[in-house]
Interface confidence: low
């Protein structure tokens, strides 16, 4: 008799996802030196264990902790790059400037980046059909509180300057529903970090204006001065000659606007 | 379009020290910067430089572990400790951003009025 098995509204664990994690922590762990002694069997069981046989809809940042412990590691402090709904161009400056760092620059990050995965109450298996959606189901499934989690983590680890990656070309350039939003701009500690600084990415062309202006980020610097915390902002008004610069910031075209 | 306007010079003793400052106004760019300087009757000469992020810095000899740049990208300004000051420091230190190769001396795309320094024996 078929078991009758929940369906939920977003797609299922990616397929391979146990060889993917584990494919991950070995590259990871061969190409950054400091994390050579994680042993990648261990990371995939705690990771494993942090939601096979439990609901998908009642995953606690508890069920991480293993995992977490397992990945702990020290990033500087000063490097951080927070971005929010403009990930891609994020991480191209993060693998030209290599000594600055996204969450998915860690290991946590990197194993799970791009990643679905949840299971099944009382069972092992992992289901590959269907996961909740965190609108729709419900927001403590396994996706979203692993986010949750290492986000805050990461926030948390900041000092400093911390750099944040803003998409201009979106209605609500700063969204306080984000995972920036409503998770790493409360756990930034106001005692460590001196200043957020926002670079807010032009997406068109011939667009002049001062995005810095708007009133999500205005609504962003009053929360953020409200923590005792300085603010400022950078418009980037071409992000392809932004990439360019930085990889080569001799060309002399670098030396004016972007 | 960039503008840059130097502070911070005046007069001070042999062997004491001032900091030179550089605000930074105009649109955000991606330019390395540094401080130059002119003495009377000679050439502009490089002095310090530094990169927009990873904050690489680089030095002429004659003022390496004497003079110590670095820039606050959040309060766009550019910095020029200067400690253990010497007669032949005096000159007018200019701020440029957009060098096109550290050091050189002539090269970059945006100056600053200069700022005089005079160092009294």
């Known amino acids: 008799v078929p078991r009758w098995r929940q369906q939920w509204s977003g797609p299922g664990t990616t397929k391979r996802f146990p060889e993917t994690v584990l494919a991950r922590c070995v590259k990871y762990t061969e190409i950054h030196p400091e994390m050579r002694h994680v042993d990648c069997q261990s990371v995939w069981d705690a990771f494993k264990g942090a939601f096979i046989s439990k609901h998908p809809c009642n995953i606690t940042e508890e069920d991480y902790q293993p995992l977490m412990k397992l990945g702990t590691q020290t990033v500087p402090c000063n490097k951080i790059l927070l971005w929010s709904r403009i990930k891609d161009l994020a991480h191209q400056f993060t693998q030209v400037q290599r000594d600055m760092f996204t969450l998915e620059d860690t290991l946590l990050g990197y194993l799970a980046d791009d990643l679905t995965w949840c299971g099944e109450f009382n069972t092992s298996k992992i289901n590959y059909q269907s996961c909740p959606d965190w609108r729709k189901d419900c927001s403590n499934n396994p996706v979203s509180v692993f986010w949750k989690t290492v986000s805050r983590r990461f926030a948390e680890a900041a000092c400093d300057v911390v750099h944040v990656m803003l998409n201009g070309s979106r209605s609500k350039i700063f969204d306080k529903n984000s995972t920036f939003g409503s998770v790493e701009v409360h756990n930034l500690q106001p005692e460590k970090v001196q200043t957020l600084e926002a670079w807010v990415i032009h997406g068109g062309r011939e667009d002049s204006r001062d995005l810095c202006q708007d009133p999500t980020i205005k609504e962003l610097e009053s929360i953020i001065s409200k923590r005792n915390i300085q603010f400022s902002c950078k418009n980037i008004y071409r992000p392809d000659k932004f990439l360019q610069c930085v990889k080569n910031p001799e060309d002399s075209s670098c030396t004016s606007e972007i | 379009q960039v503008q840059l306007q130097e502070s911070g010079g005046g007069l001070v003793q042999a062997g004491g020290s001032l900091r030179l400052s550089c605000a930074i106004s105009?649109?955000?760019?991606?330019?390395?910067m540094g401080w130059f300087r002119q003495a009377p009757g000679k050439e502009r000469e490089f002095q310090a430089g530094?990169?927009?992020?990873?904050?690489?810095?680089y030095y002429a000899d004659s003022v390496k572990g004497r003079f110590t740049i670095s820039r606050d990208n959040t309060k766009n300004t550019l910095y020029l400790q200067m400690n253990s000051l010497k007669p032949e420091d005096t000159a007018i230190y200019y701020c440029?951003?957009?060098?096109?190769?550290?050091?050189?001396?002539?090269?970059?795309?945006?100056w600053g009025q200069g700022t005089q320094v005079t160092v009294s024996s």
């Open positions: 440029a951003a957009g060098l096109k190769r550290i050091g050189d001396q002539r090269e970059a795309d945006y």
């Open positions: 105009g649109r955000t760019f991606i330019a390395d």
């Open positions: 530094i990169t927009w992020f990873g904050g690489s810095t």
